[in-house]
């Protein structure tokens, strides 16, 4: 029997469904158990205009140790504001710096990604190590990449259409799922049905889908049924803020009693059949009907309370309106420029407009120091002697204060300029990993340990090693030790920073030829990067150290020149 219920899109204010899934339009997961580097590649497609992305890397401790080093290659087609979380992960990030802006400086090693087509990017990544995972995502809002999780049967990662990334990758699309609704003709009463249909995916084994249901009704007002239909390998974990009738395939449990599994029913696997099920359960209205790819978390927010369904008029806008102004993101767009005698803050109006923000004022901590409207940007400039600047031995600090129309209290952000003339950078060479006894002598075949220090220390800035090389003169040539913040070769290791945050690395030097140079110059380029703030504040310095080389050893690892 045909059920008369004309499904029409529901406005986002009536119902919205967001979800997290491991299904990707193209992807692959491979195993590379013996690789030194775990390589992951993400191709991200965004609509025009700046987008915001939350990217989290999670490491599972293996045998009590952190996983191997990770290279994440990020290929994007348009501007992205990236919020990266990769705590404690030895991460190297390859990306296009003209398109990707970090909300906070990433605090990880970064490399410029060449402007290659997809196939060449994969080749470029594979040159650095076997690819563990690769995925193509369309307009993601957030991505979770789990490291050391690759369960793939493949030994080589080749992009294939409609792939399930398993536990390796989960992502949340920015555009919520299309929610439709309708009136079930000929049924009296006010009972409403919420129908969620999870489509089969390329799944490798059982799956639990967490379904969060948030209905904005007083508990007594609601008479509802939740119908969850999916492939046989899916079970459900339900987290609802209301009591309602549950009708599912497979098994289900409630978040408050997760260990208590309840057997579900055999349900039809067509929209018509599910509408018929709702009717059979005496629902007069389908408040939400959603079809999704295989997901791990689904969130349904609905404001209908039975019998008052409103569908959107055609044409339908399936993309929800952009979020209202995000103050945190707005503050991250303030660029700080430092000169010998002044600090300048710049806020580009084009970016502000994209965030749907209306700025009513930009000042320093001292409100009498206001920004100038320069047409396409707001510019706030002050001499270091003015506007409440705080001067310390190593830097000048202030606060940017932004008044936004949509916010009752002003937004504040610390801003800093380094006084480079007061900073001193030192290279230290040590003969043991305890970094206790400094030396100026290296012995071929013996490990040497290097630490870079800045004094006085600058807590608001991160000291990073960009590159290091050992110049051994005309006979010995140059040995590259670190390039692009990554160790070069097997005989160089980037070590954990000192407790004060000083970068450290070790290297082992061997010679294959004679004569062996007696001296060399260790040269490192370091960068001070603000922990919060804009990349345009980066400061670079090159530091040198003369080394003596003793006692030849003719077995080999790092070659000359």
């Amino acid at each position: 029997e045909t059920v008369h219920c004309d499904l029409q899109p529901v406005g986002p204010e009536r119902g919205e469904v967001t979800y997290t899934t491991s299904q990707v339009s193209k992807g692959c997961v491979a195993q590379a158990p013996n690789a030194i580097l775990e390589v992951h590649v993400l191709f991200l497609e965004f609509p025009t205009g700046p987008s915001q992305l939350e990217l989290t890397l999670q490491a599972s401790k293996q045998n009590g140790t952190w996983p191997r080093e990770v290279l994440l290659v990020l290929s994007v087609n348009s501007s992205v504001f990236l919020h990266l979380q990769a705590l404690g992960i030895p991460l190297h990030l390859a990306y296009n710096s003209s398109l990707v802006t970090f909300q906070e400086p990433p605090g990880v090693n970064t490399t410029e990604l060449p402007s290659f087509p997809k196939t060449q990017i994969l080749e470029w990544a594979a040159e650095r190590g076997p690819i563990t995972s690769a995925a193509e995502l369309n307009d993601p809002q957030s991505i979770l990449l789990r490291l050391g999780q690759a369960q793939g049967s493949l030994s080589f990662c080749m992009l294939e259409a409609s792939q399930d990334m398993g536990r390796t990758l989960e992502w949340r699309p920015r555009t919520p799922a299309l929610v439709r609704g309708c009136h079930l003709e000929g049924v009296a009463g006010h009972k409403e049905a919420h129908i969620l249909r999870v489509l089969p995916g390329h799944s490798a084994g059982p799956r639990t889908v967490t379904v969060k249901v948030e209905l904005s009704c007083a508990p007594g007002d609601l008479d509802a049924v939740l119908i969850l239909q999916g492939p046989p390998y899916v079970s459900w974990l339900i987290d609802a803020n209301h009591n309602m009738q549950i009708w599912t395939t497979g098994e289900y449990s409630f978040k408050i009693f997760p260990e208590k599994n309840i057997r579900g029913f055999k349900l039809p696997d067509t929209p018509q059949g599910l509408l018929g099920e709702a009717r059979m359960l005496n629902a007069s209205i389908v408040a939400s009907f959603v079809e999704l790819p295989l997901a791990s978390i689904v969130s349904l927010h609905a404001s209908s309370c039975g019998g008052r369904l409103q569908t959107s008029p055609a044409p339908i806008q399936t993309t929800p309106p952009k979020d209202t102004c995000s103050p945190e993101l707005l503050m991250s767009l303030i660029q700080t420029k430092c000169a010998d005698d002044a600090m300048t803050l710049v806020l580009k109006k084009e970016l502000v407009a994209h965030l749907k923000c209306t700025i009513t004022g930009l000042t320093f901590w001292d409100p009498s120091c206001e920004a100038e409207d320069r047409g396409d940007k707001f510019v706030l400039r002050s001499a270091y002697s003015s506007c409440g600047m705080q001067v310390s031995a190593s830097m000048i600090s202030n606060e940017a204060v932004v008044n936004i129309l949509s916010s009752s209290s002003p937004q504040r952000k610390k801003v800093h300029c380094l006084n480079m003339d007061s900073l001193s950078f030192q290279l230290g060479l040590y003969l043991s990993p305890h970094f206790l006894q400094a030396s100026n002598t290296i012995e071929p075949g013996q490990q040497s340990f290097v630490q870079v220090r800045v004094s006085p220390s600058v807590s608001e800035f991160l000291l990073q090693l960009d590159s290091c090389h050992l110049d051994l003169g005309p006979e010995g040539g140059t040995v590259e030790l670190i390039q692009g913040r990554a160790a070069k070769g097997n005989c160089v290791s980037l070590l954990s920073p000192s407790p004060e945050g000083d970068p450290r690395f070790s290297f082992l030097l061997h010679f294959y030829t004679v004569p062996i140079p007696k001296t060399g110059t260790l040269s490192c380029t370091v960068a001070l990067r603000p922990k919060t703030g804009s990349q345009d504040q980066e400061v670079h310095r090159t530091v040198f150290m003369r080394l003596n080389i003793i006692s030849p050893d003719l077995s080999g690892c790092t070659s000359k020149g």
Partner: antibody, heavy 117, light 108 residues
């Protein structure tokens, strides 16, 4: 509008002292650093001293260090320059200037100090 | 201490372009500001931070800075541009303001 008015100039004998003042109005005086700059007759600009908005830092040109003292009274919107042990080469028009949104963005009209026996 | 060197004088015909240079060791790494001073008047800032103009200053005034030379360029020079021009930097190593010796621009 922003106004800076210097006073206290005049003729003084070498080795003697003089105190210059600069009265500020039309802006939040306590928010801005202030400079003294001088210009000897027919010569170029010569920086003398700077004081931070709150008086926390003061810097002097080598030629006046130890002899001149810059100070400010934010409650009275006044900048001062105490000049001791004056020399003939200190003869100049003395300007006070604001260190603001732009470097030296506002200047006074200057006061002439003549050191002569 | 840091030294800025300017040519004592530059002459240019009306409507032509005047270029006034300011030399200093690695001046390109510093922010350079330019002032105009007409006889009997206090100086006026015409370019700051190498190439920015304060409001009210005509677009004819522009600046550049790299290497060991900063340059103030005045295009389509007018008689009213005749004045002394000074470059200035802040020397961070000594915490001193440094002015150049000044350049007299004569409009022929």
């Amino acid at each position: 509008q922003v106004q800076l008015v210097e006073s206290g100039g005049g003729v003084v004998q070498p080795g003697r002292s003089l105190r210059l003042s600069c009265a500020a109005s039309g802006f939040s005086f306590s928010s801005y650093g202030m400079h003294w700059v001088r210009q000897a007759p027919g010569k170029g600009l010569d920086w003398v001293a700077i004081i931070w908005y709150d008086g926390s830092y003061k810097y002097y040109a080598d030629s006046v260090k130890g002899r001149f003292t810059i100070s400010r009274d934010n409650s009275k919107n006044t900048l001062s320059l105490q000049m001791n042990s004056l020399r003939a080469e200190d003869t100049a028009v003395y300007y006070c200037a604001r260190d603001g949104k732009y470097p030296f963005d506002y200047w006074g009209q200057g006061t002439l100090v003549t050191v002569s026996s | 201490s840091y030294v800025l060197t300017q040519p004592p004088s530059v002459s240019v015909a009306p409507g032509q372009t005047a270029r006034i240079t300011c030399g200093g060791n690695n001046i390109g790494s510093k922010s350079v500001h330019w002032y105009q001073q007409k006889p009997g008047q206090a100086p006026v800032l015409v370019v700051y931070d190498d190439s920015d103009r304060p409001s009210g200053i005509p677009e004819r005034f522009s600046g550049s800075n790299s290497g060991n030379t900063a340059t103030l360029t005045i295009s389509r020079v007018e008689a009213g541009d005749e004045a002394d021009y000074y470059c200035q930097v802040w020397d961070r190593s000594s915490d001193h303001v440094v002015f150049g010796g000044g350049t007299k621009l004569t409009v022929l």
